[in-house]
Every structure is written in structure tokens, then in C-alpha cells.
């Protein structure tokens, strides 16, 4: 069968039919349905939602919809023994206690099973001691404290403000600094945008609002007890002492009202500079300990959470491909939420639901995609990307042979200003071409394309007339597909204006106030931004599954490889003497990048000219495109991070959310001037250059003519 025979309708009409079927009103309805009660991973409520989604996807017309369950390590507060932090006086009496729960939002006062704020996977403990304020608890913040200010965090409880980097990195840094406990808080400087009211009157964080979240350092391992393998019925589980990524010190999150009570009494050193000051009416003294009258008072943490092996459920829906059923395009997003999930994840899940409905409608009319589309509703994303990772571990052999692309679908919005896309360079041209065909939802851009409004509001720093597309980092369910398996991946959502809103994420992230009303009243009353995101995500899936030649452009990889090589070389050249002393050369890397560029160019020429009616040649060329991302995988992984195997991209070692290019070389160079054995350190830099150069060259050769 030719592609058009298989699909019954011309490809252009298919895409239009698919996009026209997507309706804002449906997304709104689905969001409401998904957000009326909490859907915490491992709970009965979330299991029921999984079954509801399974049933609805079947009704929508998918060929099959199955639940895939795993028994993974989760973490919950003790219902009868709540977590809190105290200020204690010299007699040990508690003279102040942090809140036990967030003030419930209007209309939700009688909802049961709202999990109180906690740091998932915190160990139990009741440490007491002096407080040290560590700013954002980034690597550079601890450098400033320890190296410049000579402040020792050993045996101290540190208090850090949320923002800038993943909370797990903050905890890891605190542990390495010798802290015995961590308090995380949301400062209004980061979570309260000027001129906007706090919820329920606006989208800002009230003082009693608290950000939940896991504090793991899994580095892509998935379930902490079964790294590398699925947590199935016959799994061998590690003991808790050998579990991957668990923190070793108690951690607890608080809001800014409670933080004020702790920070106002701080003494010791003044903040080193204005970048350490937030917006509270406190001095932001670093400590250690309290000032003057309060110097005998200490801080005590009371953490009683428990880690429990708990069953989770993914929903996996299949729409079989008519021509290449053994080629998989995956659209996945998580279903579990910390509380109501008004934005995270249900604004994404509602979009996936509507995309499934639209595909199902086309299928009922006799259409099928060329390739198989898999739809996934992941569980336990909030507990460390567990549902997606376990499923990928269970199906890794199929995925590495058949996986064409993965499109992520968590929160559809984190603002309502413009589009934000992070993806593999292979998808740049797909995203550009698609957004040129879609209408912009933005005010002032009526009748203009999404590409135009996006480019105007978020221009590329390198290429004029093009929009910014960012590197993939982690902190979401694409991680295992991209960083471990090397499947081309991308994500899209509507975001805020980063120029004017310097706060981290969106203010109500992971709080009880992330409700349906937050979205419907303040972010997207017409659900037009949700619809646009559905068109982008759905359109990408449609093209990836239905285009005769895969919509990947390998030349864009060549461009970024040169950019990344230049960047890492310039970092290394900050140490010209050592480079000379230890004979460090980047020639092999630049040579490999040059070869990649030439071979990619020739491949693209052949791609224009080959006989697309020859199914064998078509399949061969498509396989070279599909396997290009795979070719950047090093089976040995990155140093000390075996599940991060992509040589070009990895989550930053200092911030899981951010992507780092040539991460092996970058980490080898990081803080190299402080290494005790410079010869060994520069030897590792040379080894990483070798690995990177080899990988780029090997990837280039996969694009050469096969014989």
C-alpha cells in the first residue's frame, strides 16, 4: 500500500481535519473533570482516574488501551504525626511552629485527602540547631558561603529559597556542605509578581501557600529500588540503604509567612550582596544562628514521613499505524498531581485527552496514521518520573528499535505570553513549519501566525527572524526517552514573559491553590492558549506519525554541534596554561563536527532526490533519520550517571531542570582550578573530549551512504 492508500485521505486534508476537530470547550470541560479532587500518585483516587481515562480513550476509538502497573517507592506524610518546624527556647519549649496545612482555597474547604506540604522522600528526623540562610542553595551559593565568607554549614540547619534550580540539587548541595536539615521556602521575590493579587483574587502565591515536591537525586534511575529494570511482580528490590538518590537529611517546605518568623531573627553575617536579598521585611542575615536576644533559641525540625512501596498505574493507548505499525510516535504526559493539579499536570492531560479524541474521530471515519501512535497517561511523575521510566525500562528493547519520537505533555501553560519549545535539533524545522501554519492566539496578532508572534516575543539569541528553541533538560517524563534511550523528543507549552517576570516557574506551582479556577479565571478564560498548545503538540505528533519522510533535519544538529563545541572550547580556554601543560586539544572534536556537517549536508541532498515510491529505500532513509538520535547514546553513560547516556545533552549536574551541552566535558572542566590533582583532572577532560569526538564521528557515519 502507498501511504495515501493506507490513510484514505490526502495528507494535507488529514492534518487540517485533525486540527479542526480540536476544541477549546472540550479542553475546558476535561480540565474541570480532572481537577475536582486530588489525584496523588499511589492513591485510590488516582487509580480511579486511570480507569476513567482508559474507558474514555476506548470510547474515543483507540485500538487498545491498557493499564500498566508497577510497585515503586513513594513517600507520604504520617497522617497522625504531622511534619513541622519549631523555634525552641533554651528550655526546649516550642515558641513557634510552622503551619500544618495550607489555608484551603474557597470552595475546597470540605475536600478530604489534601496532602499537607512535604518534601517527598525526606528521611525521618528531629534535628535541632542553628540556622544558616543559603540563598537558593545553588553550587555557587555554597561556594560564596564556604570559600568567600568562611561560613561552615556543618551541623547546621540550612534555609534556602525555592527557585533557579531543581529542589533536589539544593538538598544534595546542602548534604555535601554537611548540613543536618534543610528548610525550603518560597520568597515573594520569586513567587509574587508585582501588581498582581494573591489567590483567590489573582495568580500570586499567598503567604500560607507552599510548594510540594520530591527531593530525589535519581539521575534518571526511575524507581529508587529497581534502577535499570521495571518494578514488576518479580522484581528484586534493593534495601533502603542502597536505594538510588534518597536524601540523607530531613527536609521540609514552608510558605513565606512562616519563613518570615524564622528569618527575622537571623544574626551572624550580613548578606554578601543584594542578590541574596528577597522581598520579605527581614535582614536576610546569613547566620549562623539568631541575633542578640534570640541567640539561645534554636530551630528544630519534626519530620515523620514514610517511604512505602506502592502500586502505580500508567494508561497506554494504541492507535495502530497502517503502513509502519512497528514505528512508534509517543505522546505522553502525567496524570498524578500533588493536589488538584489545575496546571500541573491536568492542563496537559486535558490537552492529551482532546488530542486522543480528535485522532479517534478521524479513525472512526476510516483514517489511520502511517505509523503507530502511542498515548500515555503516566503515574508518579511527581515522585521522580517513575511511571514513564518504569514503562520505558520494561519496553526498552522495543523502544530502542522502534521509537521514532516522544512528545511530552505536562502542563500546557506556565503563563499566557508566548510559546515555549524545548526539543532535539532534529525537530527544529518541524516546529518552525508547523507554527507557520497555526494561528496565533495572542492579542495584537490577530490573523498572524503563531510563528510570527512567537518569534516577535521570544526571538532566537543566534538567528534573527527565528524563535528561541531551548535544549531539553529534565524534570519531566521525556527524560528516559531522550537521555537514556536516545529517542528524538520535544515539549511545548505557553509561558510567561521571562523579561518582566523574574519569578521561578509560576507562583502557585505545586500548591493547594493550583485549581481549575486559577486557570479559568486568571490564565486562560477562553482556553485559547490551551487550544494552541493542543495544536502544536497534536500537530507534531500528526506529522511525525504521518509524513512519508520523517520530518527531521539532520543539518540543524550539525549547526548546534558546532555551537556547543565552540562554547565548551571557550570554557576550556579560560585555562590556557593548563591546556598547554597537559596537551589538551579540541581538534578531534572540531574535526568530528566538521565531518558531521558535511555528511549531514550530503544526506539531506540524497533525501530530496531519492525515489519515495520505493518502500525499501524510503524505510532505509527514515531509519537513518530515526536512529540518528540513538547514535548519540554512549552505552556506558556519563561518569557516575549511568542512566544519562546522551553525549550531546544531559541535565545539568547543578540543576536537573536545565540542559547542558557536551555534559561530560563540561563536568570535567567544572571548578577544575580547585581540584587537588590537576593532572588527573585534565586527564579526565581529555578523555571526555575523546568520547565526545568519537560519538559525533560515529553518529555522522550513520548518515553516510550505507554501501
Amino acid at each position: 500500500k502507498s501511504s495515501n492508500e493506507a490513510t484514505n485521505i490526502t495528507p494535507k486534508h488529514n492534518m487540517k481535519a485533525f486540527l479542526d476537530e480540536l476544541k477549546a470547550e472540550n479542553i475546558k470541560k476535561f480540565l474541570y473533570n480532572f481537577t475536582q479532587i486530588p489525584h496523588l500518585a499511589g492513591t485510590e483516587q488516582n487509580f480511579q482516574l486511570a480507569k476513567q481515562i482508559q474507558s474514555q480513550w476506548k470510547e474515543f476509538g483507540l485500538d487498545s488501551v491498557e493499564l500498566a502497573h508497577y510497585d515503586v517507592l513513594l513517600s507520604y506524610p504520617n497522617k497522625t504525626h504531622p511534619n513541622y518546624i519549631s523555634i525552641i527556647n533554651e528550655d526546649g519549649n516550642e515558641i513557634f511552629n510552622t503551619s500544618l496545612f495550607e489555608p484551603p482555597p474557597p470552595g475546597y474547604e470540605n475536600v478530604s485527602d489534601i496532602v499537607p506540604p512535604f518534601s517527598a522522600f525526606s528521611p525521618q528526623g528531629m534535628p535541632e540547631g542553628d540556622l544558616v540562610y543559603v540563598n537558593y542553595a545553588r553550587t555557587e551559593d555554597f561556594f560564596k558561603l564556604e570559600r568567600d565568607m568562611k561560613i561552615n554549614c556543618s551541623g547546621k540547619i540550612v534555609i534556602a529559597r525555592y527557585g533557579k534550580v531543581f529542589r533536589g540539587n539544593k538538598v544534595k548541595n546542602a548534604q555535601l556542605a554537611g548540613a543536618k536539615g534543610v528548610i525550603l521556602y518560597s520568597d515573594p521575590a520569586d513567587y509574587f509578581a508585582p501588581g498582581v493579587k494573591s489567590y483567590p483574587d489573582g495568580w500570586n502565591l499567598p503567604g500560607g501557600g507552599v510548594q510540594r515536591g520530591n527531593i530525589l537525586n535519581l539521575n534518571g534511575a526511575g524507581d529508587p529500588l529497581t534502577p535499570g529494570y521495571p518494578a514488576n511482580e518479580y522484581a528484586y528490590r534493593r534495601g533502603i540503604a542502597e536505594a538510588v538518590g534518597l536524601p540523607s537529611i530531613p527536609v521540609h517546605p514552608i510558605g513565606y509567612y512562616d519563613a518570615q518568623k524564622l528569618l527575622e531573627k537571623m544574626g551572624g553575617s550580613a548578606p554578601p550582596d543584594s542578590s541574596w536579598r528577597g522581598s520579605l521585611k527581614v535582614p536576610y542575615n546569613v547566620g549562623p544562628g539568631f541575633t542578640g536576644n534570640f541567640s539561645t533559641q534554636k530551630v528544630k525540625m519534626h519530620i515523620h514521613s514514610t517511604n512505602e512501596v506502592t502500586r502505580i498505574y500508567n494508561v497506554i493507548g494504541t492507535l495502530r499505524g497502517a503502513v509502519e505499525p512497528d514505528r512508534y510516535v509517543i505522546l505522553g504526559g502525567h496524570r498524578d498531581s500533588w493536589v488538584f493539579g489545575g496546571i500541573d499536570p491536568q492542563s496537559g492531560a486535558a490537552v492529551v485527552h482532546e488530542i486522543v479524541r480528535s485522532f479517534g474521530t478521524l479513525k472512526k471515519e476510516g483514517w489511520r496514521p502511517r505509523r503507530t501512535i502511542l498515548f500515555a497517561s503516566w503515574d508518579a511523575e511527581e515522585f521522580g518520573l517513575l511511571g514513564s521510566t518504569e514503562w520505558a525500562e520494561e519496553n526498552s528493547r522495543l523502544l530502542q528499535e522502534r521509537g521514532v519520537a516522544y512528545i511530552n505533555a505536562d502542563s500546557s501553560i506556565e503563563g499566557n505570553y508566548t510559546l515555549r519549545v524545548d526539543c532535539t535539533p532534529l525537530m527544529y524545522s518541524l516546529v518552525h513549519n508547523l507554527t507557520k501554519e497555526l494561528k496565533s492566539p495572542d492579542e495584537g496578532f490577530e490573523g498572524k501566525s503563531l510563528y510570527e508572534s512567537w518569534t516577535k516575543k521570544s526571538p532566537s539569541p543566534e538567528f534573527s527572524g527565528m524563535p528561541r528553541i531551548s535544549k531539553l533538560g529534565s524534570g519531566n517524563d521525556f527524560e528516559v526517552f531522550f537521555q537514556r534511550l536516545g529517542i528524538a523528543s520535544g515539549r511545548a507549552r505557553y509561558t510567561k514573559n521571562w523579561e518582566t517576570n523574574k519569578f521561578s516557574g509560576y507562583p502557585l506551582y505545586h500548591s493547594v491553590y493550583e485549581t481549575y479556577e486559577l486557570v479559568e479565571k486568571f490564565y486562560d478564560p477562553m482556553f485559547k492558549y490551551h487550544l494552541t498548545v493542543a495544536q502544536v503538540r497534536g500537530g507534531m505528533v500528526f506529522e511525525l506519525a504521518n509524513s512519508i519522510v520523517l520530518p527531521f533535519d539532520c543539518r540543524d544538529y550539525a549547526v548546534v554541534l558546532r555551537k556547543y563545541a565552540d562554547k565548551i572550547y571557550s570554557i576550556s580556554m579560560k585555562h590556557p596554561q593548563e591546556m598547554k601543560t597537559y596537551s589538551v586539544s579540541f581538534d578531534s572534536l572540531f574535526s568530528a563536527v566538521k565531518n558531521f556537517t558535511e555528511i549531514a549536508s550530503k544526506f539531506s541532498e540524497r533525501l530530496q532526490d531519492f525515489d519515495k515510491s520505493n518502500p525499501i529505500v524510503l524505510r532505509m532513509m527514515n531509519d537513518q533519520l530515526m536512529f540518528l538520535e540513538r547514535a548519540f547514546i554512549d552505552p556506558l553513560g556519563l561518569p557516575d550517571r549511568p542512566f544519562y547516556r546522551h553525549v550531546i545533552y544531559a541535565p545539568s549536574s547543578h540543576n536537573k531542570y536545565a540542559g547542558e551541552s557536551f555534559p561530560g566535558i563540561y563536568d570535567a572542566l567544572f571548578d577544575i582550578e580547585s581540584k587537588v590533582d590537576p593532572s588527573k583532572a585534565w586527564g579526565e577532560v581529555k578523555r571526555q573530549i575523546y568520547v565526545a569526538a568519537f560519538t559525533v564521528q560515529a553518529a555522522a557515519e550513520t548518515l553516510s551512504e550505507v554501501a
Partner: antibody, heavy 122, light 107 residues
Framework: QVQLQESGGDVVQPGRSLRLSCAAS????????LHWVRQAPGRGLEWVTL????????YYADSVKGRFTISRDNSKNTLYLQMNSLRAEDTAVYYC???????????????WGQGTTVTVSS | YELTQPPSVSVAPGQTARITCGGN??????VHWYQQKPGQAPVLVVY???DRPSGIPERFSGTNSGNTATLTISRAEAGDEADYYC???????????FGGGTKLTVL
């Protein structure tokens, strides 16, 4: 509409006990800190005690510490003040008041009840 | 911690009344102001130094710096006659503190 209504005021003898109640309506009771403030005849406002929205913190004026206990029942939308070992100087109009936000410390009291009168006299 | 208010302030109708509230380094604290008319419960007129609750006329404003907070009532009216109290939270004693009150007379 947002309302606080105190009750339980009475004439009592010194050394006796009394419990005041404050019934709330028209707002999300469990989300706000609450205070008791009193005003002796012809005198200014005197703060008595506060309780945080979740009951985790309670603070008392030195003049009532050890004798008065503040509590709340979020399921009944009611605030209480248990007054023991009453003295003549406790004679006053007792107001309950809600904070503008959940935090009971740094923020103002935006809704007040009409007050209930406690008279301590032999 | 103590807050000091003048016992009384007089103002002619249409003129501006200023009521002060003194306290050591009061500028570092959030100050709230209440109006109380005879036989009635107090009413919040300014909170967090200078913010006005809904329903309070724009004529009421506040400032706070150094050792003095000030409540300003511009274009005073007869209906503004009342006792006015300032209030702060004293974090060193964990107490709410009220000023002694100021009787405003509109002549």
C-alpha cells in the same frame, strides 16, 4: 457576607470561669488567623490572644497567660476563649477579629464582631 | 514594645489631619490603623503601613519610616470623628501591640 458573632459574655464572680464563643460565617474560616481583643470601659484596645489558622500557634498577652486558653473548631467555624481565674481587671467588651490574610502576626484585623461584655464582680 | 499616640488631635472640616504613632524603629514593622466610633467595633482603615481595605475612602492614607508611622486623613469630615488606634506585631515578645488611641475631633 463576612460576619463574626461573639457570645457567652456574662457577669461572673472573681475566680470563676467563663467560655466565650465566636461564630464565623461568609468566609473560609479555616484559612484565617483569629484574635481576641478587649476594651475595658472608657479605655483603649488591648490585645488578648491569637491563634493561627491551623491552630499550631497560640500567643497570649502577659496579663492573661496561664489563665486564658484560645482554641478553634474549624469544622464548626467557631473560635473559643476559655477564661479561668477571672479578675476584676478582666472586665471588658471582648471582640473576636479575623486577620486580613492567613498570617495572624504581621497583618491587620479586617473583620470584627460586635463584642460581648464580660463583667467580673463580687 | 510600646506605641505612643497623642491623646487627641483636632482638625477643621476640609483640612488634613495627621495622627502619629511612635515606636522604636517602627519603620521596620507593618503598621495597621483602626477607627472606632462610640459604641461600635473597630474598623480597619489602613493596613501594611499604607494599603487601604475596599470601602475605605482614598482620603485615608498611611506612611511609615524611622520611628514614626502616620495616618493622614485629608479633607476631614464630621463623620471621621472617632478614636484611632495604631497596631503592630512585636516579634521580640510575640505580642500584638496597640497604641493608646487618639481621639480625632473635627471642629
Amino acid at each position: 457576607q463576612v460576619q463574626l458573632q461573639e457570645s457567652g459574655g456574662d457577669v461572673v464572680q472573681p475566680g470563676r470561669s467563663l467560655r466565650l464563643s465566636c461564630a464565623a460565617s461568609g468566609f473560609s474560616f479555616s484559612g484565617y488567623g483569629l484574635h481576641w481583643v478587649r476594651q475595658a470601659p472608657g479605655r483603649g484596645l488591648e490585645w488578648v490572644t491569637l491563634i493561627s489558622y491551623d491552630g499550631s500557634n497560640k500567643y497570649y498577652a502577659d496579663s492573661v497567660k496561664g489563665r486564658f486558653t484560645i482554641s478553634r473548631d474549624n469544622s464548626k467555624n467557631t473560635l473559643y476563649l476559655q477564661m479561668n481565674s477571672l479578675r476584676a481587671e478582666d472586665t471588658a467588651v471582648y471582640y473576636c477579629a479575623k486577620t486580613t490574610v492567613s498570617d495572624p502576626y504581621y497583618y491587620g484585623m479586617d473583620v470584627w464582631g460586635q463584642g460581648t461584655t464580660v463583667t467580673v464582680s463580687s | 514594645y510600646e506605641l505612643t499616640q497623642p491623646p487627641s488631635v483636632s482638625v477643621a472640616p476640609g483640612q488634613t489631619a495627621r495622627i502619629t504613632c511612635g515606636g522604636n524603629n517602627i519603620g521596620s514593622k507593618s503598621v495597621h490603623w483602626y477607627q472606632q466610633k462610640p459604641g461600635q467595633a473597630p474598623v480597619l482603615v489602613v493596613y501594611d503601613d499604607s494599603d487601604r481595605p475596599s470601602g475605605i475612602p482614598e482620603r485615608f492614607s498611611g506612611t511609615n519610616s524611622g520611628n514614626t508611622a502616620t495616618l493622614t486623613i485629608s479633607r476631614a469630615e464630621a463623620g471621621d470623628e472617632a478614636d484611632y488606634y495604631c497596631q503592630v506585631w512585636d516579634s521580640s515578645s510575640d505580642h500584638v501591640v496597640f497604641g493608646g488611641g487618639t481621639k480625632l475631633t473635627v471642629l
